[in-house]
Interface confidence: medium
């Protein structure tokens, strides 16, 4: 059975694998693959060494130790939930069926992000949120994982929540660029829209005043500009399909104390809707 190793979303995972070269410097080819070790080779190879060097690797997968001394432990950078599973380290010792095979089970836990206290107007929408960091190299785009669901009313506190999480520390340290895409589930939006319409009708029936309807805050988004995310989400809720995708939500971590976010619609307006979170 596999030995189990654990890591949290956004952290680096470490999967140990060692061998002793028959003679110093006489390296043995090694492969790392996703999935249990098959009869030969590695399935879904993520990294490979030969008698001299690492000759194949994929983004985020590294040998941080001195592989020339037999330390072929795998480091996976900025793990995501999808990195969970069994990994095969295969020491390809020459000869028939001489290979040493090690199956290591990696369990990824979601990052701990404390949910903010809900505000009075608690319209909770469960929409998955993907947090990705884009490294600077062409082959370095990584998905870090999913944040827990938060209320629409809590979006303005997202930066503070990020700051408090271990994930944010990793992101700040790496100076990564963060992209947050918000996908609103059609069914949830439809239900939410119906509830809001129903509420608005009752409110209208009680108030007998058009002015009060106009002043109704559909969604309260504290500290965000009225033309920004609140309107984008509100427009999405009013849309025919009840689906709205904010495609380019970019949090750019340029300095340790500041998060910037630019919200733009599918049409890519010339002036992106903006919000800026300054970290105290």
């Amino acid at each position: 059975s596999e030995v189990e190793y654990r890591a949290e979303v956004g952290q680096n995972a470490y999967l140990p694998c060692f061998y002793t070269p028959a003679a110093p410097g006489n390296l043995v080819p090694v492969c790392w693959g996703k999935g249990a070790c098959p009869v030969f080779e590695c399935g879904n190879v993520v990294l490979r060494t030969d008698e001299r060097d690492v000759n194949y690797w994929t983004s985020r997968y590294w040998l941080n130790g001195d592989f020339r001394k037999g330390d072929v432990s795998l480091t996976i950078e900025n793990v995501i939930l999808a990195d969970s599973g069994i990994y095969c380290c295969r020491i390809q010792i020459p000869g028939i069926m001489n290979d040493e095979k090690f199956n290591l089970k990696l369990v990824i836990k979601p990052a701990k992000v404390t949910p903010a206290p809900t505000l009075q107007r608690d319209f909770t929408a469960a929409f998955p949120r993907m947090l990705t960091t884009r490294g600077h190299g062409p082959a370095e785009t990584q998905t870090l994982g999913s944040l827990p669901d938060i209320n629409l009313t809590q979006i303005s506190t997202l930066a503070n929540e990020l700051r408090d999480s271990r994930l944010a520390n990793d992101l700040r340290d790496s100076g990564a660029t963060i992209r947050i895409g918000i996908y609103i589930g059609a069914g949830i939006c439809a239900g939410l829209a119906l509830a809001l319409i129903f509420g608005a009708l009752i409110f209208k029936w009680y108030s007998h005043s058009k002015e009060k309807i106009q002043n109704l805050s559909l969604i309260s988004l504290a500290n965000l500009p009225p033309s920004g995310l609140a309107n984008a989400v509100a427009e999405g809720i009013r849309s025919e399909e009840n689906i709205y995708t904010i495609e380019e939500n970019v949090y750019e971590v340029e300095e340790p104390n500041e998060y910037y976010c630019y919200v733009s619609s599918r049409q890519q307006p010339s002036q992106p809707l903006g919000c800026r979170f300054a970290m105290p």
Epitope: N26, L27, E51, W62, L63, F67, R68
Partner: antibody, heavy 121, light 107 residues
């Protein structure tokens, strides 16, 4: 203490040969890659080639391929650079350096003091 | 071969100054960039490896960073012993290649 000491430099005529030695102490060259780097007078650094003494595999810069040969004697913990068909442009201080592995690639953490090779008639 | 274009080729600075040297790779080299310091008549010394990792024993005033194919060596507060020539090197592909060097002189 890790140390690399080059020797064997000197004046040689164009077309001539020279053998440089790089004696290592404080570590086993079999476990490492030994690189040769040269520096022409008043110029920058240029990688010449390397050897992994334990396995014997070598790599060379195009400018010296087929003329220079890198070898090692692990029992003496020494690497060698055999230079044949020398040209005036090979005039330089030759350094040997130890490869330091991190994230699968070598940078050079220990260097010898260098030995001057002058190719002139 | 990958070209490493280093700038400036020389600079004059005073003790206590913040000094920045940049190196641009002609193609992606991931984080496989090292920085070396060389003084006249001496062998180079490793300062930074893997773009941003400070080598053992190197003062913390030296730092390295990466932005795409641009790499930067920063000396936060120049000391008298820092006047030297600095080289970047990519060791991502064979052959490893060096920048042409930056000479840091006393103003």
């Amino acid at each position: 203490e890790v140390q690399l000491v080059e020797s064997g430099g000197g004046l040689v005529q164009p077309g001539g040969s020279l053998r440089l030695s790089c004696a290592a102490s404080g570590f086993n060259i079999s476990n490492n890659v030994i690189h040769w780097v040269r520096q022409a007078p008043g110029k920058g650094l240029e990688w010449v080639g390397d050897i992994m003494p334990g396995g014997g595999s070598t790599d060379y810069a195009d400018s010296v391929k087929d003329r220079f040969t890198i070898s090692a004697d692990t029992s003496k913990n020494t690497a060698y650079l055999q230079m044949n068909s020398l040209r005036a442009e090979d005039t330089a201080v030759y350094y040997c350096a130890r490869g330091y592995v991190y994230r699968m690639w070598d940078s050079y953490d220990y260097w010898g003091q260098g030995t001057l090779v002058t190719v002139s008639s | 071969d990958i070209q490493m274009t280093q700038s400036p080729s020389s600079l004059s600075a005073s003790v206590g100054d913040r000094v920045t040297i940049t190196c641009r790779a002609s193609q992606d080299v991931n984080t496989a960039v090292a920085w070396y310091q060389q003084k006249p008549g001496k062998a180079p010394k490793l300062l930074i490896y893997s773009a941003s990792f400070l080598y053992s024993g190197v003062p913390s005033r030296f730092s390295g960073s990466r932005s795409g194919t641009d790499f930067t060596l920063t000396i936060s507060s120049l000391q008298p012993e820092d006047f030297a020539t600095y080289y970047c090197q990519q060791h991502y592909t064979t052959p490893p290649t060096f920048g042409q060097g930056t000479k840091v002189e006393i103003k």
